[in-house]
């Protein structure tokens, strides 16, 4: 893949680009200062850098005002002002507002429920496989394998708390050491960030919305990946997380506490348990190499059971296999021992849809996966629609001002830390970082929250989910208390360390810049979002997993050259943007590489070929399934009508900064690809009915 995928037509002077370029400004000024703007009518004029003497700046007309795609949109209020309404109109407006609020809360409820069902669906589809990942003995010695197992398992079960609880039970059963568990916890942290990235994909219909939403979601991914990139080697070298948490656990004499309060679950559980109920213990049992669990179904059938403990006589191959020497005998033919067995009597069946279907887990999982994604997508569209109609004019101004404005000087720096606390608090209330960050994603998309503000909220969410885990650990039974608490604390300190790395100094807020870069690329090539998701959450972890199984020699043999190439590319990239003169002429830009290695355009052509059937007409038969069509064919008219629409993308390709004689001076053509910009009209045009 290209080092920076947006380097199609690089200029002779690589460090002179238009402002707003995707990935062209690694040291882009922090936009947090701009967040005070509430009404973005004064869009910043695109700065045209002076090009070398051979360039013909006069060829370019008066620079057109190109909106910075990261500026929050102004949600114009097209309705009648309150003061201009009559009494009847005011009453109607009031009830409309109440109705909208009820609808918003209703859709938000089903949105959260669908996230819960989505997690259940993933567990049904991949839960057993996830459990088997844990039973790999190499985890003990290979932290990298532990990391990718943490990622894969959490992605497969869509719940970091499930994967963490498996780790806890394995540690308390001495199947895993705390040292080996730490990389798995780090991986779980990465895996949990896939949920809001999936949610962001649902906003693919509108380019500018998608740019913001996808960047807002992936800021979480980048924070987690970068934290692991730095902290995993540090942990392997120093074991600082293990040591700190061990000291804390040993210095306190904890008594078993109460369970962490289930605030949101109280509301959602009555509905979700009517859809499906799972026996989560099965995944843990598989992880602990329980052979019988492999044939068990994850779908819970019996909810009320009576457990009776009894002792039975069982035959054993030899007296060495006896449970205890005193409980061992022979009948003259076979050797016998006494075994404690728990006899389970089923009393009442569960009350959910799938209880009497007796379908295989994969079938139930697939049905729920499709349905939950449809509901998730539908709810998201409706939430965005309702918010769009509510957050207009004055209301939007007030909300944006409240959320995105910093404290007055000299306390402006405290705003972000307050946002971290708010994120942690909200996550603690909803008991799930996935739910909180997923709810945040559409708000970023429609422009209510800036990415700069969403970033600390997301970091807070990471902290919030660990405080929940700490409380849950304090409620664990005696034998699991120490291990679960130590693991929860490792998770907590890992996130604290990550925040210290990537938040306090604005320059180090690398995740924001990376997420914006990815947002620009994904807005231009929407298929790249899916590609990113598959690569980062499946292919890379699976590749590392496969190489680890082949042995550390293979892992090192493949890994070292790959890491070397990445470092080389990054160093070259840095030199190109900061001090290109130290580089030989050839290396001052990426033009020495074939086009497919430095631009996504050729790849786009390949993807377009595969999705050729969608290319001419995007069938938007329903507002939900057209989202998938938008990703595949990049149709800009998607979801503006319920009929099929023509793809006028090519007709708009040429609309750019007008150049008088481009064919003569193609060496200085500033391609739109390099800017990562798309005219605002691009996704707003109404569909033309066929």
């Amino acid at each position: 893949m290209a080092p920076w995928p947006e380097l199609g037509d690089a200029q002779p002077n690589p460090d002179k680009y238009l402002e707003g370029a995707a990935g062209q400004q690694p040291t882009a000024p922090d936009k947090s200062k701009e967040t005070n703007k509430t009404d973005n009518t004064e869009a910043p004029v695109t700065k045209i850098e002076l090009l070398p003497s051979y360039s013909t700046a006069t060829l370019i007309d008066e620079p057109t005002e190109v909106d910075d795609p990261w500026n929050l949109p102004t949600l114009q209020d097209s309705g009648i002002k309150w003061s201009e309404r009559d009494t009847k109109g005011k009453i109607l407006c009031f009830f409309q507002g109440i109705g909208r609020l009820i609808l918003l809360l209703g859709f938000l409820y089903f949105f959260v429920c669908s996230l819960d069902i989505l997690s259940s669906a993933f567990q049904l589809v991949g839960g057993k496989m996830a459990g088997q990942f844990f039973s790999n003995s190499s985890i003990m010695s290979n932290p990298l394998l532990g990391l990718v197992i943490g990622v894969l398992v959490t992605v497969l079960v869509q719940s970091s708390s499930t994967s963490t609880s498996i780790v806890v039970s394995m540690v308390s059963s001495s199947l895993l050491t705390v040292r080996a568990a730490i990389p798995i916890i780090m991986g779980a942290n990465i895996g949990t960030s896939i949920t809001n990235t999936i949610v962001a994909l649902m906003q693919v219909g509108d380019r500018s919305e998608f740019r913001r939403a996808f960047a807002g979601a992936t800021v979480h991914d980048f924070f987690n990946w970068l934290s692991v990139l730095v902290l995993l080697p540090v942990e392997v070298a120093t074991h600082y997380l293990e040591i700190i948490t061990q000291l804390i656990v040993e210095s306190f004499h904890f008594k078993n506490g109460e369970d962490a309060p289930d605030l949101l679950k109280v509301i959602t559980k009555p509905f979700t348990k009517l859809i499906v109920q799972l026996d989560k213990k099965v995944i843990s049992q598989i992880a602990m190499n329980d052979e019988k669990a492999k044939n068990k179904s994850l779908v819970k059938i019996w909810c009320k059971t009576f457990t009776n403990k009894t002792q039975i006589n069982v035959t054993v191959p030899s007296t060495a296999n006896c449970t205890s020497p005193s409980l061992c005998w022979t009948d003259g033919i076979q050797n016998w021992t006494m075994k404690n067995v728990t006899y389970k009597e089923n009393i009442a069946k569960c009350q959910h849809i799938f209880v009497n279907f007796h379908l295989p887990d994969l079938a139930v999982g697939t049905i729920l996966l499709i349905l939950s994604l449809l509901v998730l997508c539908g709810c998201l569209i409706m939430i965005v629609k309702i918010l769009g109609s509510v957050l207009k004019g004055q209301v939007a101004t007030v909300i944006k001002k409240t959320i995105n404005t910093d404290f007055p000087f000299p306390f402006a720096w405290l705003t972000g830390y307050l946002a971290i606390l708010v994120g942690a608090g909200m996550t603690f209330i909803v008991q799930s970082s996935s739910v909180f960050t997923s709810a945040l994603t559409p708000l970023i998309g429609i422009g209510v929250i800036t990415i700069e503000r969403a970033y600390p909220l997301t970091l807070g969410s990471n902290i919030g989910t660990t405080t929940t885990a700490i409380l849950a650990a304090l409620a664990s039974p005696g034998n699991a208390l120490r291990s679960s608490l130590q693991i929860a604390l490792c998770h907590f300190f890992f996130n604290i360390s990550g925040i210290l790395l990537w938040y306090p100094i604005p320059f180090t807020r690398l995740p924001i810049r990376m997420a914006k870069g990815l947002g620009n690329i994904s807005a231009k090539y929407r298929w790249f979002a899916v590609f990113y998701l598959i690569i980062f959450f499946f292919l890379i972890p699976l590749t590392v997993f496969g190489l680890s199984l082949a042995g550390w020699r293979v892992l090192v043999g493949v890994g070292v050259p790959v890491v070397f190439i990445i470092i080389l590319v990054l160093c070259l990239r840095l030199l190109q943007s900061r001090c290109p003169r130290v580089l030989p002429k050839k290396l001052q830009n990426w033009n020495f590489l074939p086009l497919w290695m430095r631009s996504l355009k050729p790849w786009d052509a390949v993807v377009s070929k595969f999705t050729g059937c969608f290319q001419m007409r995007c069938c938007c038969c329903c507002r939900v399934c057209c989202r998938a069509c938008c990703l595949l064919c990049d149709c800009p008219k998607c979801c503006r009508c319920s009929k099929c629409c023509e793809d006028l993308e090519e007709a708009q390709e040429g609309q750019d900064v007008p150049v008088k004689a481009p064919e003569t001076f193609d060496n200085i053509t500033i391609s739109r690809e390099a800017q990562g910009e798309v005219p605002a009209s691009d996704s707003k045009t109404e569909c033309t009915a066929l």
Partner: antibody, heavy 119, light 107 residues
Framework: QVQLVESGAEVKQPGESVKVSCKAS????????MHWVRQAPGQGLEWMGA????????GYSQKFQGRVTLTVDKSASTAYMELSSLRSEDTAVYFC????????????WGQGTLVTVSS | DIQMTQSPSFLSASVGDRVTITCSAS??????VAWYQQKPGQSPKLLIY???TRHTGVPSRFSGSGSGTDFTLTISSLQPEDFATYYC?????????FGQGTKVEIK
């Protein structure tokens, strides 16, 4: 009630074989092990082996391994013990005994069969 | 093979006496020990199993105790019908072995 009736006394010459039968009644024959224990005149008890009529599985004392064969006829509820290569020291009373369920205890004993080995 | 050693080999007692017979195993047999009574010219009878559990129809004056390697059979009040030879037997593993017997005679 449980009854075990053994075949009559036998006189054998050294090197010959003897087959003692034991007819069981009063219980489910196939569900209990049948043990064979011998007692030399004026001596203690010595366990020879056991058979589970339900499956035909057997267990033998190392001392008698290869010389003793335990069999059953489920339809006749009869157990058999065959001891080959008889020696004078094999002169003893041979008991068939019903085993305890899943235990190596011996609940009910037959009246015993005296086998005399003399030249 | 596990050896079972009984003591004493002979025991003289009067009716009404409290009699104790001990049995020692050459290795740990847990509680897998049974006691038998054999009267002259008769087949043995099961008295105790699991070291201390009385078999059906066995009078309560017979009791057993012990675990591991040392076991005891106690007759709390000796009756005329109790004069016989008593054997201990382990069923920890194959082969099952008996003690050499303890003969209880009238004093």
């Amino acid at each position: 009630q449980v009854q075990l009736v053994e075949s009559g006394a036998e006189v054998k010459q050294p090197g010959e074989s003897v087959k003692v039968s034991c007819k069981a009644s009063g219980y489910t024959f196939a569900s209990y092990n049948m043990h064979w224990v011998r007692q030399a005149p004026g001596q203690g008890l010595e366990w020879m082996g056991a058979i589970y009529p339900g499956s035909g599985n057997t267990g033998y004392s190392q001392k008698f391994q290869g010389r003793v064969t335990l069999t059953v006829d489920k339809s006749a509820s009869t157990a058999y013990m065959e001891l080959s290569s008889l020696r004078s020291e094999d002169t003893a009373v041979y008991f068939c005994v019903r085993g305890g369920r899943g235990l190596g205890t011996m609940d009910y004993w037959g009246q015993g069969t005296l086998v005399t080995v003399s030249s | 093979d596990i050896q079972m050693t009984q003591s004493p080999s002979f025991l003289s007692a009067s009716v009404g006496d409290r009699v104790t017979i001990t049995c020692s195993a050459s290795q740990d047999v847990g509680s897998s020990v049974a006691w038998y009574q054999q009267k002259p010219g008769q087949s043995p009878k099961l008295l105790i199993y699991w070291a201390s559990t009385r078999h059906t129809g066995v009078p309560s004056r017979f009791s057993g105790s012990g675990s591991g390697t040392d076991f005891t059979l106690t007759i709390s009040s000796l009756q005329p019908e109790d004069f016989a030879t008593y054997y201990c037997q382990h069923y920890r593993n194959i082969p099952l072995t008996f003690g050499q017997g303890t003969k209880v005679e009238i004093k």
